[in-house]
């Protein structure tokens, strides 16, 4: 993986752009660790499998996280 030799953070830039939950393949939340001091949110898009880093402080992204967790809780018994 590029850059992994020097640092373990994943995100080089972050995005505030709202993401349509329907276009999401996967959403990963990586908590801060000894390797990377900040929380990272990585969205994998259905289109071409693009991965996009999202801004955890953005209102739109916070709303996305709420929507995704609500969807998950609906699915689980």
């Amino acid at each position: 993986i590029p850059l992994s030799r020097t640092v373990r953070c994943t995100c080089i830039s972050i995005s505030n752009q709202p993401v349509n939950p329907r276009s999401l393949e996967k959403l990963e939340i990586i908590p801060p660790s000894q390797f990377c001091p900040h929380v990272e949110i990585i969205a994998t898009m259905k289109k071409k499998g693009e991965k996009r880093c999202l801004n955890p402080e953005s209102k739109a992204i916070k709303n996305l996280l709420k929507a995704v967790s609500k969807e998950r809780s609906k699915r689980s018994p």
Partner: antibody, heavy 124, light 109 residues
Framework: QVQLVESGGGVVQPGRSLRLSCTAS????????MHWVRQAPGKGLEWVAV????????SYADSVKGRFTISRDNSKNTLYLQMNSLRAEDTAVYYC?????????????????WGQGTTVTVSS | EIVLTQSPGTLSLSPGERATLSCRAS???????LAWYQQKPGQAPRLLIY???SRATGIPDRFSGSGSGTDFTLTISRLEPEDFAVYYC??????????FGPGTKVDIK
């Protein structure tokens, strides 16, 4: 509008130091990784260094490793390149460039905004 | 270290013609890591394509990118007068971490 403006270039003797600055406006600087890319007279593009949005990720081309240091001050919307032990082969136009929104180690969105460059000449 | 080779070095064409520019990597490159740039004399480069085939914001649809593995292509379907420039491919992911090809100059025949 979205803009990057480089400054700090000039004529310097071999072995001396120089610090370049790049001031950003028109976008949220603290969200974007930033690069320095250089172009020697009549030559192609050469990537120099990258710094992540939070300053944690830093990486350098082999040709400048140990001599150049990339840094940023998000409160001042400014990117820096500290260049020490300068050599004649460092003579070039130095561009700062913005990393695309959301870029990460798995998917690269390219350098989507560039400054107009500042000229560094290393000569005795 | 992955080395990028671009061919031809110079492409002489007329406005309206189709331009096909090649970028070859010395080892396989993920298409997620391949970009193309345009540079005109005295100007900064401009991002055209990222992810091997996705057009950057504001880039006309006459520009398209394709390819995978070691072979990538930038195609300009119909050359406009403003398209005569130098084109660079770039890969991300090995040491040095961002590598540019030597460029292809598209000039007027």
């Amino acid at each position: 509008q979205v803009q990057l403006v480089e400054s700090g270039g000039g004529v310097v003797q071999p072995g001396r130091s120089l610090r370049l600055s790049c001031t950003a406006s028109g976008f949220t600087f603290s969200k974007h990784g930033m690069h320095w890319v250089r172009q020697a007279p009549g030559k192609g593009l050469e990537w120099v260094a990258v710094i992540g949005f939070a300053g944690v990720i830093k990486s350098y081309a082999d040709s400048v490793k140990g001599r150049f240091t990339i840094s940023r001050d998000n409160s001042k919307n400014t990117l820096y390149l500290q260049m020490n032990s300068l050599r004649a082969e460092d003579t070039a136009v130095y561009y700062c460039a913005r990393e695309g929104e959301g870029s990460n180690i798995y998917f690269y969105y390219g350098m989507d905004v560039w400054g107009q460059g500042t000229t560094v000449t290393v000569s005795s | 270290e992955i080395v990028l080779t671009q061919s031809p070095g110079t492409l002489s064409l007329s406005p309206g013609e189709r331009a096909t520019l090649s970028c070859r990597a010395s080892q396989s490159v993920s298409s997620s890591y391949l970009a193309w740039y345009q540079q005109k004399p005295g100007q900064a480069p401009r991002l055209l394509i990222y992810g091997a085939s996705s057009r950057a914001t504001g880039i006309p649809d006459r520009f398209s990118g394709s390819g995978s593995g070691t072979d990538f292509t930038l195609t300009i379907s119909r050359l406009e007068p403003e398209d005569f420039a130098v084109y660079y491919c770039q890969q991300y992911g090995s040491s040095p971490i961002f590598t540019f090809g030597p460029g292809t100059k598209v000039d007027i025949k």
